[in-house]
């Protein structure tokens, strides 16, 4: 009696259980009563990442430099190419199909987390006692200068965008 279900890594065709082709290989012809499945490797720049009965391999992803992309990991016959973004850029999606320039944190904000190839810069407002006077994708909020440790006094209070201004202590004559 012909089978209605097949074992793992097999498929049912013409009432016959045939072996699936291994990752990296495509199906050329199905098995018969007398012959095994015919499989051949994927061509250059092609891949199949599962046990399969595909008659065509998938093309490796192209990391288009015009979109700010570069190859992070070269594809094989069993894996797709992994793209990432050029320095200073990050992916717009998980699939990393294009890149955008990393965001800079405005004055009054510092970098909480530096951007990576796949995530943008995370900014945070500078809390009391800290400032940032530049627009930057790298600079954290800096602490206000401690006038006391320099035997100076605060002449001008700091803000989230400016450091304190220290000056000499008034001398008693």
């Amino acid at each position: 009696e012909p089978p209605t279900a097949c074992r793992e890594k097999q498929y049912l065709i013409n009432s016959q259980c045939c072996s699936l082709c291994q990752p990296g290989q495509k199906l050329v012809s199905d098995c018969t009563e007398f012959t095994e499945t015919e499989c051949l490797p994927c061509g250059e720049s092609e891949f199949l990442d599962t046990w399969n009965r595909e008659t065509h391999c998938h093309q490796h992803k192209y990391c288009d430099p015009n979109l700010g992309l570069r190859v992070q990991q070269k594809g094989t016959s069993e894996t797709d190419t992994i793209c990432t973004c050029e320095e200073g850029w990050h992916c717009t999606s998980e699939a990393c199909e294009s890149c955008v320039l990393h965001r800079s944190c405005s004055p009054g904000f510092g970098v909480k987390q530096i951007a990576t190839g796949v995530s943008d810069t995370i900014c945070e407002p500078c809390p009391v006692g800290f400032f940032s006077n530049v627009s930057s994708a790298f600079e954290k909020c800096h602490p206000w200068t401690s006038c006391e440790t320099k035997d100076l006094v605060v002449q001008q209070a700091g803000t989230n965008k400016t450091d304190v201004v220290c000056g000499p202590q008034d001398r008693l004559r």
Partner: antibody
């Protein structure tokens, strides 16, 4: 008995052409992918061409791509290798081989035919 | 292209010795590695397919092992008829490639 018999090897001048044949018997020729493999005078083996069982897929290394063509005639149980623009580095013993279906290892080899490219 | 490096290039042994022939791939080829024996003035003959599967007619003293990049052909107690060339061959990627061979000779 499974058998592969090559013919057509000859002495040919650089730039010349040659067609090798391989007569298959003792198995269902149309069920198997076939290949040509050559062995150079220094005894190195080099894969030259592959054709799938139905003839729909052909593959070549860069060294022969555009110069060599593999084909098959199912009705005649014969495999062919058309070679053109021959170079001295094509000098070798050419073997016709049958491939396993699921695993394309070369499970049957012919006795070979000698191709010499020299002026 | 995948490069297959066979070692040693020549192995001189006495009948009765047990030997191991190595084949190393330049990148992973899963288990798509095959071994051939070629005696003087003869065509190559498939001994082992898929790294470790014996072919019908291959004597039991021959065995294959390995996966990925490192493969071994072992001959348990070499017989005089075993002398000749041994080639490894990968069919994981195009172009198919062969190792340069190991010559097994009588000491």
């Amino acid at each position: 008995e499974v058998q592969l018999v090559e013919s057509g090897g000859d002495l040919v001048k650089p730039g010349g052409s040659l067609k090798l044949s391989c007569a298959a018997s003792g198995f269902t020729f149309s069920s198997y992918g076939m290949s040509w493999v050559r062995q150079t005078p220094d005894k190195r083996l080099e894969w030259v061409a592959t054709i799938s069982s139905d003839g729909s897929h052909t593959y070549y290394p860069d060294s022969v791509k555009g110069r060599f063509t593999i084909s098959r005639d199912i009705a005649k149980n014969t495999l062919y290798l058309q070679m053109s623009s021959l170079k001295s580095e094509d000098t070798a013993m050419y073997y016709c081989v049958r491939q396993g279906r699921y695993v394309p290892s070369f499970d049957v080899w012919g006795a070979g035919t000698t191709v010499t490219v020299s002026s | 292209d995948i490069v297959l490096t066979q070692s040693p290039a020549t192995l001189s042994v006495t009948p009765g010795d047990s030997v191991s022939l190595s084949c190393r791939a330049s990148q992973s080829i899963r288990n798509n590695l095959h071994w051939y024996q070629q005696k003087s003035h003869e065509s190559p003959r498939l001994l082992i397919k898929d790294a470790s599967q014996s072919i019908s007619g291959t004597p039991s003293r021959f065995s294959g092992s390995g996966s990925g990049t490192d493969f071994t052909l072992s001959i348990n107690s070499v017989e005089t008829e075993d002398f000749g060339m041994y080639f490894c061959h990968q069919t994981n990627n195009w172009p198919f490639t062969f190792g340069s061979g190991t010559k097994l000779e009588i000491k």
